[in-house]
């Protein structure tokens, strides 16, 4: 399981406000089990995007069907993008646990840019 | 955490219905496939399907397929199984089981639900 | 289908000595890199305890005494030092296809 590695493809990302950003992620592994999470920004700050396990984030969907066998695809888009949504995002695979999951290993990162709305 | 409660014990007349339930909490319900499995007194453990709720997709155990039907509610994030026309060798405790990896396991349990079949 | 045969069906083992399941399968389970396999743990009155998945991978919480081995079609679970608290049934589940369950092994102290 240590061979296990999450890659973020794109070190940037750009995307005109108003439309959706796709940040793309996925792992190399189906072991550890454990949910994948996406954060924006690193260290204690770091805001949650979105929690595969469980929350409600009505602006993130997933790219693949995460309960589907052998996937291994955590894409995220996420929809009606502002400026404030600019900044740097990690996808972060976590390890099953008990009570709680363990954060496991991180992707490089993403970092999304943001344009003004076209006129 | 990851909590599954069943519905409580059920005494049936050979020929008749049951439904047991199990309502899913510490998780987002569609995420993750949910199991059926039963265990007759003293015997081991039989699959009988797995449904994912977020898209109802279901697959049976033949044995079963002509007598039991999975649906979940995803409002009250509640998974339930029928088992229709029992007869006494369906005495058993009826189990679900959240998979947690997509590995078609079964990672958390339900405490069971005992059903009876007896004239 | 897919049939898995574990033996013995019953294991008597002193404290602290090593105990050994094994499971076999009809045919290989293994696909896209991994072995389909799962062991559990089913003490009496209780659910079933997810022990090892994907043949070799402990579950969370799961001792280090316990351990799974095997490729293809042959499994085994190995406690290396057996504890009081290890007294239950054993069973294994494949998921190459639809899931299905060895008939179990009752591990007893001697």
């Known amino acids: 399981e240590e061979g296990l590695q999450v890659i973020q493809p794109d070190k940037s990302v750009s995307v005109a406000a108003g439309e959706s950003a796709i940040l793309h992620c996925t792992a190399t592994s189906l072991i550890p089990v454990g949910p994948i999470q996406w954060f924006r920004g690193a260290g204690p700050g770091r805001e949650l995007i979105y929690n595969q396990k469980e929350g409600h984030f009505p602006r993130v969907t997933t790219v693949s069907d995460l309960t589907k066998r052998n996937n291994m695809d955590f894409s995220i888009r996420i929809g009606n993008i502002t400026p404030a949504d600019a900044g740097t995002y990690y996808c972060v695979k976590f390890r099953k646990g008990s009570p709680d999951d363990v954060e496991f290993k991180s992707g490089a990162g993403t970092e999304l840019s943001v344009r003004a709305k076209p006129s | 955490q990851v909590q599954l409660v069943q519905s409580g014990a059920e005494v049936k007349k050979p020929g008749a219905s049951v439904k047991v339930s199990c309502k899913a909490s510490?998780?987002?319900?569609?995420?993750?496939?949910i199991n059926w499995v039963r265990q007759a007194p003293g015997q081991g453990l039989e699959w009988i399907a797995m449904?994912?709720?977020?898209?109802?997709?279901?697959h049976y155990n033949q044995i079963f397929k002509d007598r039991a039907t999975l649906t979940t509610d995803t409002s009250t994030s509640t998974a339930y199984m029928e088992l229709r026309s029992l007869r006494s060798d369906d005495t058993a405790v009826y189990y679900c089981?959240?998979?947690?990896?997509?590995?078609?396991?079964?990672?958390?349990w339900g405490r069971g639900t005992l059903v009876t079949v007896s004239s | 289908d897919i049939v898995l045969t574990q033996s013995p069906d019953s294991l008597a083992v002193s404290l602290g000595e090593r105990a050994t399941i094994n499971c076999r399968a009809s045919?290989?389970?293994?696909?896209?890199?991994?072995?389909?396999i799962f062991w559990y743990q089913q003490k009496p009155g209780q659910p079933p305890k997810l022990l090892i998945y994907?043949?070799?991978n402990r579950d969370s919480g799961v001792p280090d005494r316990f351990s799974g081995s095997g490729s293809g079609t042959d499994f085994t679970l190995t406690i290396s030092s057996l504890q009081a608290e290890d007294v239950a049934v054993y069973y294994c589940?494949?998921?190459?296809?639809?899931?299905?369950f060895g008939q179990g092994t009752k591990l007893e102290i001697k």
């Open positions: 449904i994912d709720p977020s898209d109802s997709e279901t």
């Open positions: 089981a959240m998979d947690y990896g997509s590995l078609y396991a079964m990672d958390y």
């Open positions: 045919q290989s389970v293994r696909s896209s890199g991994y072995n389909w």
């Open positions: 589940q494949h998921s190459r296809e639809l899931p299905t």
């Open positions: 510490g998780y987002t319900f569609t995420n993750y496939w």
């Open positions: 994907l043949a070799s």
